[in-house]
């Protein structure tokens, strides 16, 4: 951080770290969540053979996980900062119900699952501060989310394991795309 005017620099530890910019803070937060996802994926892959499964399509039909598309303006071709930022925030808000689902899915990584969920809420806050066009951001309907959660929790064990794997994989891909896009902003 900078040395306050009027103060002798010897009073302040050197070298001085500037406070994080909003972009740096967002970048660090996404990486923090990605590290958490890595830990959760390790447990999922150790516990079942879902990570090598070719039957993903069966479970994927039940899920409507957020994905980046050309029209979202987050890819290098056709990049649009405002559209993309809205997509990232909307996507993260849509992922929240799936992160809630993950909360009871881990034995040894219970804390990490909670951390990923909480850190995502913080990330949304950071991004909302950055976004000017907040009107364009639609918040998922709580009733719809509640019934989706009930439906996911009622699946058989195999489908629940597959759902967990797919959520983690999709969330990782979404965050990686977001990270790339945000670095262009």
């Amino acid at each position: 951080a900078p040395v306050p005017p009027g103060e002798d620099s010897k009073d302040v530890a050197a070298p001085h770290r500037q406070p994080l910019t909003s972009s740096e803070r967002i970048d660090k937060q996404i990486r923090y969540i990605l590290d958490g996802i890595s830990a959760l994926r390790k447990e999922t892959c150790n516990k079942s053979n879902m990570c090598e499964s070719s039957k993903e399509a069966l479970a994927e039909n039940n899920l409507n996980l957020p994905k980046m598309a050309e029209k979202d303006g987050c890819f290098q071709s056709g990049f649009n900062e405002e559209t993309c930022l809205v997509k990232i925030i909307t996507g993260l808000l849509e992922f929240e119900v799936y992160l809630e689902y993950l909360q009871n899915r881990f034995e040894s990584s219970e804390e990490q699952a909670r951390a990923v969920q909480m850190s995502t809420k913080v990330l949304i806050q950071f991004l909302q501060k950055k976004a000017k066009n907040l009107d364009a951001i639609t918040t998922p309907d709580p009733t719809t989310n509640a019934s989706l959660l009930t439906k996911l929790q009622a699946q058989n064990q195999w489908l629940q394991d597959m759902t967990t794997h797919l959520i983690l994989r999709s969330f990782k891909e979404f965050l990686q795309s977001s990270l790339r896009a945000l670095r262009q902003m």
Partner: antibody, heavy 115, light 107 residues
Framework: YIQLVESGGGLVKPGGSLRLSCAAG???????MSWVRQAPGKGLEWVGS????????YLNTKFIGRFTISRDNSKNTLYLQMNSLRAEDTAVYYC?????????WGQGTLVTVSS | AIQMTQSPSSLSASVGDRVTITCHGS??????VAWYQQKPGKAPKLLIY???SNYPSVPSRFSGSGSHEDYTLTISSLQPEDFATYYC?????????FGQGTKVEIK
Amino acid sequence: YIQLVESGGGLVKPGGSLRLSCAAGYEFTHQDMSWVRQAPGKGLEWVGSISPKGDHKYLNTKFIGRFTISRDNSKNTLYLQMNSLRAEDTAVYYCARDIDFFDTWGQGTLVTVSS
Amino acid sequence: AIQMTQSPSSLSASVGDRVTITCHGSYWLNSEVAWYQQKPGKAPKLLIYDASSNYPSVPSRFSGSGSHEDYTLTISSLQPEDFATYYCQQYRYHPYTFGQGTKVEIK
């Protein structure tokens, strides 16, 4: 939340040394980390912080020359090496994730400097 | 180093009371101020960052405000679990500095 577990505290004589460790619950390669201390019945005092790769270290000037911060990302562990300890260094030492403010803290480890 | 002067150092209040704690920085802080709650024998918990943003899962009865050098933490309706010590922290300048704390006790 992400577990940060400090260890290495204990009783040490004035002039002695101690190395505190802070183990993270999972990979913390991309995180700035800090040490914050609290003397018994007193307020919080920032000791210093370290960048993700360990290439930038920021120490509160009052500890320069006596305390050193380091990290081993392969072990997901943060360290605080304290030399020439004084009675006034008696405190609970916390490690915390640093994004300018501290959103995740360890439970703390007590360091007592006494003869 | 930047001084963070917190007041009062302690206060007695009843459940349901509105409580206000202030923090004055010795220089302009650009809203780069956080507030923490600490209970005996526990690590501090982040409540507010950037002067007025509630950390997720922090109850809405906690709010932060302020600008320039002066910042405030308000608890709109004190609950039994809110009896604790509260600290402000500035992160505009190194070294990061904390206020000396405000102990909120039961009247």
